[in-house]
């Protein structure tokens, strides 16, 4: 491991040894919520480190996290979801660092799924639809979605469209003819709850029709 900077700077920020970040997922398993935390510094020796959450809990004062490999995880119904909780990194009984966090401000939605694209020949467009488990939830129901698409050959030239519904229409004339496209979607809380983007959905691939030379229009596949 020669040449590896054990005490080098973190790329984005100067962080103390025990800086950590967390996200919550509400009603992720029936009525159970989850909270996941991890250290930001990949060099932290986590062998004897534990996480604990206290405050803004129902029926209990504190809860301990389970360590899953190199993350820390709780699944429970006991989050009050009103006010701030205190999340601490502990070694034995000693707290090394703590953060006061309102769990409703660090919500990471579940990834959208069932993404598909249907070509409408008469309308000369593509209808993009997808699903989200949040339509059935009590808490985090309102999301903003980010649909990203690109021509498969263009490594990093993504076009992004933000929308609040789960349906989007892409005009055929805005896309290249006879090209393979990749499309994916992610979600973020958009009303009352705050937080982070979900993971991306699995990608969906579709091909645009050829141009019909006589009319200048695309042929369906």
């Amino acid at each position: 491991e020669s040449g590896y900077a054990q005490n080098g700077d973190l790329e984005d920020a100067e962080l103390d040894d025990y800086s950590f970040s967390c996200y919550s997922q509400l009603e992720v398993n029936g009525s159970q919520h989850s909270l996941t935390c991890a250290f930001e510094d990949p060099d932290v020796n986590i062998t004897n480190l534990e996480f604990e959450i206290c405050g803004a809990l129902v029926e209990v004062k504190c809860l301990n996290f389970r360590k899953l490999q190199e993350i820390y995880f709780i699944e429970t119904k006991k989050f009050l979801l009103i006010g701030k909780s205190n999340i601490c990194v502990k070694v034995g009984e000693k707290s090394l660092t703590c953060k006061k966090i309102d769990l409703t401000t660090i919500v990471k939605p579940e990834a959208p799924f069932d993404l598909s694209v249907v070509y409408r020949e008469g309308a000369n467009d593509f209808v993009v639809t997808f699903n989200t488990s949040h339509l059935q939830k009590k808490y985090v129901k309102v999301l903003m979605h980010d649909v990203a698409y690109r021509q498969e050959k263009d490594e990093n030239k993504w076009t992004h469209v933000n929308l609040s519904s789960t349906k989007l229409t892409l005009l055929q004339r805005k896309l290249q003819p006879a090209a393979m496209y990749e499309i994916k979607v992610r979600s973020i809380p958009d009303h009352y709850f705050k937080g982070f983007w979900s993971e991306w959905s699995p990608s969906y691939y579709f091909r645009t029709p050829e141009i019909n030379n006589s009319s200048g229009e695309m042929d369906p596949i």
Partner: nanobody, 117 residues
Framework: QVQLVESGGGLVQPGGSLRLSCAAS????????MSWYRQAPGKEHELVAS????????RYADSVKGRFTISRDNARNQLYLQMNSLEFEDTAVYYC??????????WGQGTQVTVSS
């Protein structure tokens, strides 16, 4: 069974760029600190860059700092290494693996990066 498949290497001139990818399977990728390592002929594995489980913290070897960028996509179990301003000394076989290796962990086949004019 843990599987790590690296790709994206090649022959590049000094000052050029490459983007390495690693497809991981057989373990819970999103729960692990991940790293890129490299091995030059006749040398030990050298730790090049590491990234936290959420991707919000990174570390780099002094020799690559400011030139290489590690990133990850937990939805796709993918690890990446963007390599810019490549130098002759970057020539090596590049491997991805866990930062904290388990006793049973093997290495993938790696991807060869050759910097030559």
């Amino acid at each position: 069974q843990v599987q790590l498949v690296e790709s994206g290497g090649g022959l590049v001139q000094p000052g050029g760029s490459l983007r390495l990818s690693c497809a991981a399977s057989g373990f819970t990728f999103s729960q692990r600190i991940m790293s890129w390592y490299r091995q030059a002929p006749g040398k030990e594995h050298e730790l090049v860059a590491s990234i936290s489980p959420f991707g919000d913290g990174t570390r780099y070897a002094d020799s690559v700092k400011g030139r290489f960028t590690i990133s990850r996509d937990n939805a796709r179990n993918q690890l990446y290494l963007q390599m810019n301003s490549l130098e002759f000394e970057d020539t090596a076989v590049y491997y991805c693996n866990k930062r904290n290796l388990d006793v049973s962990d093997d290495w993938g086949q790696g991807t060869q990066v050759t910097v030559s004019s």
